[in-house]
């Protein structure tokens, strides 16, 4: 079998949901000593980078300026050390937001409920779209989808304090082009878990894995580079649409 290097890790810096006309940054984390990185978009070569000097950094950041629906879609990357190419990274779905209109998000029976109550979110958008998306702040990889002509329902079933948090919804014009986000709706769940005050709440900061962890080489990093890369590939889970 043809020998290949371990696959790189592709990430979106800050977020994979990029407002139109803003810049997206994608990092491809490969290996110290990589002489070339390639970013592929929808299966075709999109950008090429040759780090200088190659042995000093374990990846590159690709910028995608002026985000629009043409640049939204599936990205992957590969790298080369000498003449040897890596396997292809997982696919990363890059979404353009702030397209066209703003949906309205509401929750029934209301934003303050008791643990065990059934809760349904409603996302409404009057313009031509049939797919709606509900995201919880700090959990933007866990996208819930629902379909409807101008409104979609998101039944949550009986809720627990783990459902607490801030929610937004989007209308989707295709998998990679989303509307402006709705105003957030904060769901407060109180109730009969032993001690509600100690119940965990979700972080409201951006997803912790949406960061580019590129490092410059030191002696220790050189020794750990391959082990670290293999470990990260093993543990890195990436959301697919």
């Amino acid at each position: 079998p043809k020998q290949t290097l371990p696959k790189p890790i592709i990430r979106a810096e800050s977020t994979y949901m990029v407002p139109k006309e803003k810049q997206a940054t994608l990092c491809c984390q490969g290996s110290y000593g990589a002489v070339e990185y390639q970013l592929h978009f929808e299966g075709s070569l999109f950008a090429v980078e040759r780090p200088k000097p190659p042995e000093r950094i374990n990846g590159v950041k690709f910028h995608i300026p002026d985000m629009n629906s043409r640049k939204a879609g599936r990205y992957s990357c590969i790298y080369r050390v000498g003449e040897l190419w890596s396997e292809r990274s997982d696919l990363l779905d890059l979404v353009v937001t702030e397209m066209y209109d703003t949906p309205t998000l509401s929750v029934h029976p209301g934003p303050e409920v008791t643990s065990g109550e059934k809760v349904t979110f409603y996302c409404r958008l009057d313009t031509a779209t049939s797919m709606f998306l509900l995201l919880k702040e700090g959990r933007s990889r866990d996208v819930q989808r629902s379909y409807g002509k101008v409104q979609a329902e998101f039944p949550m079933g009986p809720v627990t304090t783990a459902h607490r948090g801030s929610y937004r919804c989007f209308g989707s014009y295709n998998n990679y082009a989303w509307s402006f986000p709705s105003e957030p709706v904060k769901l407060l769940v109180t109730g009969d878990i032993e001690n509600t005050s100690l119940a965990p709440t979700d972080p409201t900061f951006p997803d912790s894995w949406d960061t580019c962890l590129l490092t410059r080489e030191t002696g220790l990093q050189k020794d750990l580079a391959l082990w670290d890369h293999t470990a990260q590939n093993h543990h890195h889970h990436h959301h697919h649409h």
Epitope: F46, A47, V48, E49, R50, P51, K52, H63
Partner: nanobody, 129 residues
Framework: DVQLVESGGGSVQAGGSLRLSCAAS????????MGWFRQFPGKERERVAL????????FYADFVEGRFTISLDNAKNTLSLQMNSLKPEDTAMYYC??????????????????????WGQGTQVTVSS
């Protein structure tokens, strides 16, 4: 404003050579990509060769097969494409383009033509058998 003016196109026999030039003016950024693209009638422009001012680093399309060489004379702000061993299938309109680098380091280039902001008017290359 950025201006790109190509020259050097013309007609040549198969196996012959041509040197295309592109005079660039007005680019304010220190690092940028310049490239040669070509277009066949009724088709989209395709990349031929790219060069990054930060390297300079060069990138070629597979079909070039070592026949073409891209170079940049920073002092004269001139981009060149030396085309050797020309084939009839190289007949096309050739365009010079400029755009931003694909990263902060300035050592990378975008590949799709829609990532390039500035274009010359094109120069025709005709290779007869």
């Amino acid at each position: 404003d950025v201006q790109l003016v190509e020259s050097g196109g013309g007609s040549v026999q198969a196996g012959g050579s041509l040197r295309l030039s592109c005079a660039a003016s007005g680019y304010r950024s220190r690092h940028y990509c310049m490239g040669w693209f070509r277009q066949f009638p009724g088709k989209e422009r395709e990349r031929v060769a790219l060069i990054n001012t930060g390297g300079p680093t060069t990138f070629y399309a597979d079909f070039v097969e070592g026949r073409f060489t891209i170079s940049l004379d920073n002092a004269k702000n001139t981009l060149s494409l030396q085309m050797n061993s020309l084939k009839p299938e190289d007949t096309a309109m050739y365009y010079c383009a400029a755009g931003p680098p694909s990263s902060d380091s300035g050592s990378g280039c975008y590949v799709p033509e829609y990532m390039y902001n500035y274009w010359g008017q094109g120069t025709q290359v005709t290779v007869s058998s």
